[in-house]
């Protein structure tokens, strides 16, 4: 008989990453019968909230059904009718959530409470809503950049099927920057560690892994800068604060209520004689630099060696992909290719912050103000964090690749949150045969 | 691993009322859909009902449907079956059940990871 191909059974899954600037869904399909198989998971779509973060919704949660109304029904686009009912829905909401939890349990609850009551009026099968630790997102997010990469399939391929896949086992790092947090994962050349607190230990296709993890919180983009400023304006004589992070010609009014709202500037906080002030921007990248430097104490270490602020840091080992907003922010200076060094990264920095407000502006018009505004900063924060904050060198540089996406999917944490959570990354090595993933009579 | 405790159980008259209480120890409570489940003598263990970690979703099993309900106090870390109208037939073991970030469908079909209570029983007779 002819051979036929027969309707592969195809399954879904949607997972929420609510972060603290915005919310995100990612759609993943993957075939029913290879579910434990490494690498056949992939992403369909990503579809952005309109908005801010959840955490913002605060005060008004009753906005919240209409927030996450156009992406859901994308999802009900995208996902066929049949499967609706089967596929689960997850939400995990990372540091901006957990920054609102320290202010009050009570607050984070009412707004988790009604994500679940709106996301519980769709066909799908929604399995929860919840903030995910720190060092879940940091795993997490080494889990789905590994998994894409091949690096947990058993078969050794004389070809490549990613850009960065180098023919061996060995795991990639995975470096995740955020708005409020920023996560280091990796395999580290020493199994022992000196801090429990940072040490995963994994059962994965038939391999173990131990992993060091850590994440920073206030240590994302827009948490950082918020810190910055909150220590920056201590020492201001006046209601004017000449900064450096900042083009040239740029002007900005900052409340100082919005300053301090957050807990990531409570080490800063002082009563100030006014309740306003104004950047100006001087764009100078050494002294942005320096000033950014400042928010990260090296001075105290109870260990052998640490990132900053006291945490345990293992040598650094192996390469790493840096995502999210590393990937962001390095897309949009253009500074991701392998071939750029960390000098020449520096020097193009120094040029591009020293560059006139509004020659940026004319350069970037489609770019929206806000987020123009602080690609100078974003960028030096970059630098500073991986050089200073995780001791990157000149020469290890280059083990950085800057991902936004492997094989169509995103870098990030929700891929490998889906895989755990419905159980489809297997502690042993499933046992292949030939003939069961066959589609074909 | 989270630690199930039921109370509430024992001796009822058919038409009477009874609610059991189950209180959850270690893990964040709303990550957790909660559930009961019974177990006649001499027959498998089913599934009664469950609820999701804020309470907005409730499943039910057709036998209970109109008789009981299922709610939850999360301040109180308190699942509670609330039951009803009840029949020698609902004469059972009744279990307390948590899963993790999984459905009330899901547990319905007694799906995932489930953790279970030591159970409480409950008794219907004239």
């Known amino acids: 008989t002819q051979n036929k191909a027969l309707p592969e059974n195809i399954k879904y899954g949607i997972v929420l990453d609510a972060g603290s600037s915005h919310t995100s869904l990612y759609i993943y399909k993957w075939p029913a019968e290879k579910e434990n198989d490494t690498g056949v998971v992939h992403q369909v779509e990503e579809c952005r909230v309109k908005g801010p973060g959840i955490s913002k919704y605060v005060q008004k949660v009753n906005e919240i059904g209409i927030y996450l109304t156009d992406c859901m029904e994308r999802a009900r686009e995208v996902i066929p009718r049949s499967q609706h009912q089967e596929t689960p829905v997850y939400l995990g909401a990372t540091a901006g959530m957990r920054l609102l939890r320290m202010e009050s349990e009570e607050l984070a609850d009412r707004v988790l409470d009604v994500v679940e009551r709106s996301l519980s009026n769709y066909p799908f099968d929604f399995q929860g809503a919840r903030i995910i630790t720190g060092q879940e997102e940091g795993a997490y997010g080494w889990i789905t950049i590994n998994y894409l990469l091949g690096k947990f399939s058993q078969k050794t391929r004389w070809f490549s099927i990613v850009p960065y896949e180098t023919n061996n086992q060995e795991t990639f790092g995975a470096l995740d920057l955020g708005g409020a947090s920023t996560q280091i994962t990796f395999v580290p050349q020493n199994q022992t560690t000196e801090s429990p607190d940072n040490a995963l230990q994994f059962r994965l296709y038939g391999k173990d892994y131990n992993v060091y993890t850590h994440s920073f919180l206030c240590y994302g983009k827009d948490q950082a800068l918020w810190q910055k400023l909150a220590k920056d304006i201590q020492v201001a004589s006046n209601e004017i604060l000449r900064d450096p992070c900042f083009h040239p010609g740029y002007k900005k009014v900052v409340n100082v209520s919005d300053l301090y709202k957050t807990p990531c500037t409570k080490r800063f906080e002082m009563t100030l004689p006014f309740q306003q002030f104004e950047i100006q921007g001087i764009g100078n990248y050494q002294q942005c630099h320096q000033s950014v430097l400042e928010l990260f104490n090296t001075s105290y270490c109870p260990y052998s060696q640490c990132a900053f602020n006291g945490i345990f840091l293992p040598p650094l080992q192996g390469d790493f992909g840096a995502f999210s907003a590393f990937y962001f922010v390095m897309n949009f200076l253009n500074l991701t290719s392998e071939k750029v060094s960390q000098e020449k990264v520096t020097e193009m920095m120094k040029k591009f912050c020293s560059q006139p407000w509004e020659e940026i502006k004319t350069s970037y018009a489609g770019v929206k103000e806000k987020y123009l505004s602080e690609y100078c900063f974003s960028g030096t924060y970059i630098l500073s964090l991986l050089l200073q904050g995780y001791h990157f060198t000149a020469d290890s540089w280059e083990h950085i690749h800057f991902i936004g996406k492997i094989q169509g999917s995103d870098a990030g944490w929700t891929l490998g949150y889906m895989l755990n959570l419905t159980n489809m990354i297997p502690a042993e090595q499933p046992l292949s045969t030939p003939l069961s993933h066959s589609t074909y009579v | 691993e989270v630690q199930l405790l039921e109370s509430g159980g024992g001796l009822v008259q058919p038409g009477g009322s009874l609610r059991l209480s189950c209180t959850v120890s270690?893990?964040?409570?709303?990550?957790?859909?909660m559930g009961w489940f019974r177990q006649a003598p001499g027959q498998e263990r089913d599934f009664v009902t469950a609820?999701?970690?804020?309470?907005?979703?409730?499943h039910y099993a057709d036998s209970v449907k109109g008789r009981f309900t299922i709610s939850r106090d999360n301040s109180k870390n308190t699942v509670y079956l609330q039951m009803n109208s009840l029949k020698p037939e609902d004469t059972a073991v009744y279990y307390c059940?948590?899963?993790?970030?999984?459905?009330?469908?899901?547990?319905?079909?007694?799906?995932?990871?489930?953790?279970w209570g030591q159970g409480t029983q409950v008794t219907v007779s004239s």
């Open positions: 059940a948590a899963a993790w970030q999984t459905s009330p469908r899901r547990m319905m079909q007694m799906a995932g990871s489930i953790t």
């Open positions: 270690r893990g964040t409570f709303s990550e957790y859909s």
């Open positions: 609820i999701s970690g804020f309470g907005h979703i409730t």
